[in-house]
Interface confidence: low
């Protein structure tokens, strides 16, 4: 599968497994699914801590991961065509296993809207910082990876398996080894809670002697919401150790008989359960009558009880269950208020960040600030947003309108801007003329020059800056364009229908490009723009005059 289970944490009614292996999100989900789970949800701070713990287990010691940042898939995805919803904590993403739009989120940074492809979420771990329960892994969204191409995939993933309930780990009263096999095919000898339908293999004895005994148990549902192994009495008991080994495997008290045998007992106020090991309280709160995080408080003399809710919750009409108090009704925030279980949090709209005077205040994010501008050229900050602009000769481009693209003025929508030859450059253009013609002072038109078979005028050569048009005599056939000041190929002309009769012969000549009259004093490096041209003196159909050129990389007809 490309992934190995290397860590497992079971808590509450779920187990989380962490895996390393460069899989796509789809492959990771398939791996979890094969064992009856899904990519993990992170629906609360508590769940985030469970996931953090299993990742910490996976990444301990000299992990193979050498990168400073590491990512692990979780089950949060957004389908192609579904757009970002900034008003929701999950921003329009949803959990792969289904379920409601949960209030907890921990995004790494502001999400950019893009609906054109499926997006998947991973947990971002900064390996240069220690994990703390207060510093939970951030959520990072991005492409979902490609099956079969490890280079495009991230370091691992986390699965979640949910169960009806859990059994307590088996307690041994003497030497032995317990091996649990879970329904999701993980074996472990150390689980805090063991999921329903797991098997436990108990090998009693010292391990290096022949006198080992084996027991096999299943974690079963004994009664609604009551799960146990169906074992009776401590396991692997040994007269040699009595109560000295692991308290005889007893939950509370261990009482030894004279012959090395022993029994488990319970402290005052507790009773021994059917497994003859575990103790449960006798008081009315022991049946956990309070729900939804409510605490059971014993009344006088232990006869009755009341339920008490934690801060941010209140009892419902049954007086047994806690319901969340909606603190947002008091409008405590400047912009967005998100009611959370037991509290609330203030959020800022896209384009704003927490800050400014007062609790829950927001201030504008200066997206154009030095070092963080998303724009290729000009950036203007606005309240809650920004917009990009481009220098003259460029237009906004890119999916998000932050890039600038050169305008090819020579093939612009208004038709050619020059009467004869047009040289596109980065951010600008120049006009030129055919042999025998010179550029008029307006820099666009061509006028008849002194009779000459010189080359067309165009951008200057390194050596020829300032030379008069038409002052050289052409020599050879289709030569490469000369190179400009920075050593990049210079522009070759695009011809437009000249406003002159095209019966002047065109000789085979290198295009020695000269400065057009009226060209700006500052040289702007042009990009290559080839003319589609014949290589000899001829008259193309339609009466167009063409200039023969060939690029030095052997391509033609493309910019």
């Amino acid at each position: 599968t490309g992934a190995d289970t290397e860590a497992v944490v079971c808590v509450g009614t779920a187990c989380y497994t962490a895996h390393s292996g460069k899989l796509s999100a789809a492959e990771a989900q398939n791996h979890c699914n094969q064992n009856g789970g899904n990519l993990a949800t992170v629906k609360s701070k508590e769940e985030a801590q469970h996931v953090q713990r299993v990742l910490a287990q996976l990444l301990r010691r000299e992990a193979a991961l050498t990168a400073r940042m590491s990512k692990f898939w979780i089950g949060l995805q957004r389908e192609k065509g579904k757009c970002l919803d900034p008003s929701l904590p999950l921003k329009g993403f949803s959990w792969v296993g289904g379920g409601e739009d949960t209030p907890y989120s921990n995004w790494h940074k502001e999400l950019r809207n893009s609906c054109i492809s499926k997006r998947c979420v991973s947990l971002l771990l900064d390996l240069s910082q220690p994990l703390l329960p207060s510093r939970l892994p951030k959520w990072s969204e991005g492409p979902c990876g490609s099956p079969g191409s490890p280079g495009s995939n991230i370091e691992g993933f986390v699965c979640k398996f949910s169960f009806k309930g859990m059994c307590r780990p088996l307690a041994l009263g003497g030497p032995g080894q317990v091996t649990y096999t879970t329904p999701f095919q993980t074996t472990s000898s150390s689980l805090e809670a063991v999921p329903f339908a797991s098997a436990a293999n108990v090998a009693c004895g010292e391990g290096d002697k022949d006198e080992t005994q084996s027991h096999y148990f299943l974690c079963k549902e004994k009664a609604p919401d009551v799960f146990d192994w169906g074992s009776s009495g401590p396991l692997c008991v040994s007269p040699k150790y009595g109560c000295n080994f692991n308290n005889g495997g007893c939950h509370q008290d261990c009482f030894e008989g004279g012959d090395g045998s022993f029994l488990c007992g319970c402290r005052p106020g507790f009773r021994l359960l059917d497994d003859l090991v575990t103790c449960a309280s006798r008081n009315p709160c022991s049946s956990s009558p309070c729900r939804g995080g409510a605490t059971c408080v014993l009344g006088p003399h232990g006869k009755n009880y009341t339920c008490r809710c934690p801060q941010g919750y209140q009892l419902d009409s049954s007086q047994l269950d806690c319901v969340d108090v909606d603190e947002c009704q008091d409008s405590p925030c400047a912009q967005e208020c998100v009611n959370t279980p037991g509290g609330f949090r203030c959020e800022c709209w896209v384009g704003y960040e927490p800050g400014g005077p007062g609790e829950g205040a927001c201030q504008d994010v200066d997206e154009c600030a030095l070092g963080r501008s998303p724009c290729a050229q000009g950036c203007t900050n606005t309240d809650g947003s920004f917009h990009c602009s481009c220098e003259e000769g460029y237009v906004l481009a890119g999916e998000d309108g932050t890039q600038c693209q050169d305008v090819d003025e020579c093939v612009g929508p208004g038709g050619p801007l020059c009467d004869s030859l047009c040289f596109n450059t980065q951010g600008s253009f120049h006009c030129g003329c055919l042999p025998g013609w010179v550029l008029a002072p307006n820099g666009v038109s061509c006028t008849m020059g002194p009779v000459s078979l010189g080359p067309p005028s165009g951008p200057p050569d390194e050596e020829d800056k300032g030379e008069k048009e038409g002052s050289t005599v052409p020599r050879a056939a289709t030569a490469s364009p000369t190179r400009g000041p920075e050593g990049t190929p210079k522009a070759t002309p695009t011809t437009s229908r000249p406003s002159l009769s095209s019966d002047a012969p065109i000789t085979s000549a290198p295009l020695k490009m000269l400065a057009p009259s009226g060209s700006p004093g500052v040289w702007r490096e042009p990009s290559i723009h080839h003319a589609t041209a014949a290589s000899g003196p001829q008259e193309p159909a339609g009466g167009d005059s063409s200039v023969a050129t060939q690029n030095n990389d052997g391509t033609d007809g493309q910019k």
Epitope: R53, L55, A56, Q57, L59, R60, R61, E62, A63, L125, L127, S128, Q129, P130, L131, L132, P133, S189, S190, E192
Partner: antibody, heavy 122, light 107 residues
Framework: EVQLVESGGGLVQPGGSLRLSCAAS????????MSWVRQAPGKGLEWVSA????????YYADSVKGRFTISRDNSKNTLYLQMNSLRAEDTAVYYC???????????????WGQGTLVTVSS | DIQMTQSPSSLSASVGDRVTITCRAS??????LAWYQQKPGKAPKLLIY???SLQSGVPSRFSGSGSGTDFTLTISSLQPEDFATYYC?????????FGQGTKVEIK
């Protein structure tokens, strides 16, 4: 081979200062949180302070908070403990130790130095 | 702070004996527990991490178990080089805390 070597211990008067150093080798120093643990003569182990791999996060026991400062120089692979306003009860062998995990704090301490004795006495 | 209580504080045993040391946390610490061995004049040495995982290079006669609040270090067959003081340490939360130690002496 992972090695941690402490230095800088010695005799100091109450109220005085001392700076301990711990030179690390054999592993990528900047990837690991590091801790100082002390042991008073004939007593058990007491965690004193810790610092994250990057040096961005520091942690202290209440007994030394405000008096001791932990720092590190990742370019020199060295951990430091600046001890000010020393008291008689700070007398102990001070060990520098590596946190066993690159990712979780606090963690077990998988490699220890040989220790350096600090005696605070008038 | 989480208190760690070890028992017994000292014990006498013979080579070949099975020795069990227990450590109890004042609150649940999941499996975030380590065991160390310290010999006189030497630095502590990590034996067990994550309650039951054997540190690389440590003999297999050492084993750890437990979860939550109750933990056990077992030496299945005591060897001469195992006479030392053993400490448990929780690393569930800051500050990490150690047990007071259990001294294993020759009977």
């Amino acid at each position: 081979e992972v090695q941690l070597v402490e230095s800088g211990g010695g005799l100091v008067q109450p109220g005085g200062s001392l700076r301990l150093s711990c030179a690390a080798s054999g592993f990528t120093f900047s990837s690991y949180a590091m801790s100082w643990v002390r042991q008073a003569p004939g007593k058990g182990l007491e965690w004193v302070s810790a610092i994250s791999g990057s040096g961005g996060s520091t942690y202290y026991a209440d007994s030394v908070k405000g008096r001791f400062t932990i720092s590190r120089d990742n370019s020199k692979n060295t951990l430091y403990l600046q001890m000010n306003s020393l008291r008689a009860e700070d007398t102990a062998v001070y060990y520098c130790a590596r946190d066993g995990s690159r990712i979780y704090f606090p963690d077990d301490l998988d490699y220890w130095g040989q220790g350096t004795l600090v005696t605070v006495s008038s | 702070d989480i208190q760690m209580t070890q028992s017994p504080s000292s014990l006498s045993a013979s080579v070949g004996d099975r020795v069990t040391i227990t450590c109890r946390a004042s609150q649940g610490i999941s499996s975030y527990l380590a065991w160390y061995q310290q010999k006189p004049g030497k630095a502590p040495k990590l034996l067990i991490y994550a309650a039951s995982s054997l540190q690389s290079g440590v003999p297999s006669r050492f084993s750890g178990s437990g979860s939550g609040t109750d933990f056990t270090l077992t030496i299945s067959s005591l060897q001469p080089e195992d006479f030392a003081t053993y400490y448990c340490q929780q690393h569930y939360t800051t500050p990490p805390t150690f047990g007071q130690g259990t001294k294993v002496e020759i009977k």
